[in-house]
């Protein structure tokens, strides 16, 4: 069981306290109410690329 804040989720996912696991941020546009989507807003998605060096 992961303690929040100890092991970060992989890029493009966020921790869900309601499900006790990392969840894919890609599902958030379809269902923004999910608790983990708050964390997705603070982190860039997996496909995000910086436009500057």
């Amino acid at each position: 069981e992961r303690v929040p804040g100890t092991t970060p989720c992989s890029r493009g996912s966020s921790w869900s306290a309601d499900l006790d696991k990392c969840m894919d941020c890609a599902s958030c546009p379809a269902r923004p109410h999910s608790d983990f989507c708050l964390g997705c807003a603070a982190a860039p998605p997996a496909s995000f690329r910086l436009l500057w060096p």
Epitope: E1, A17, D18, L19, D20, A30, R31, H33, D35
Partner: antibody
Framework: EVQLLESGGGLVQPGGSLRLSCAAS????????MIWVRQAPGKGLEWVSY????????HYADSVKGRFTISRDNSKNTLYLQMNSLRAEDTAVYYC?????????????WGQGTLVTVSS | DIQMTQSPSSLSASVGDRVTITCRAS??????LNWYQQKPGKAPKLLIY???SLQSGVPSRFSGSGSGTDFTLTISSLQPEDFATYYC??????????FGQGTKVEIK
Amino acid sequence: EVQLLESGGGLVQPGGSLRLSCAASGFTFSPYPMIWVRQAPGKGLEWVSYISPSGGSTHYADSVKGRFTISRDNSKNTLYLQMNSLRAEDTAVYYCARGGDTYFDYFDYWGQGTLVTVSS
Amino acid sequence: DIQMTQSPSSLSASVGDRVTITCRASQSISGYLNWYQQKPGKAPKLLIYQASSLQSGVPSRFSGSGSGTDFTLTISSLQPEDFATYYCQQSYTSPFITFGQGTKVEIK
């Protein structure tokens, strides 16, 4: 075979307390979110409460918030619902149900229910 | 809160009939809609999840369709064991879920 068995229902006076239990068997209990749903006599289904697999996250319907407490003991494969300050409108059959294995989109196994009657 | 409205509230049908029950959400819930069957004195049983996926062990005469706000449960050929009450349930706002008021399918 997956089984959920509720117990603890009965007749209680308004303002009283009751603790419901839901004993799980036939599957590994700890990874699954669980809920309580109730059904008043002759009425439809009403969601009551949710608990995450670890028990660290809980949610309640507005109608029971501040009076009911959901909890679980994963070492005992048991889900609980502590019901305080009971009202006549809490009279219902209470069901526990298991959430889906990837999300809590659906509830695939339900107990047989336990009847709670609040009356003086 | 999202309200779920089923229609009709009850219906009478004969064995072999095609039966359709509708469920309407007060706002779009995408495809996050489940259907349950409940017989008197028994617990609800999951039939369809995520609008159109048939739960394991459920006969293929049951099917679900729809997305957004309008959903349908269809029983292609009603069997004696299908006389029951059917509930829709939205999981778009999970874990804060809501059920429809139910549709009772009775024998004509």
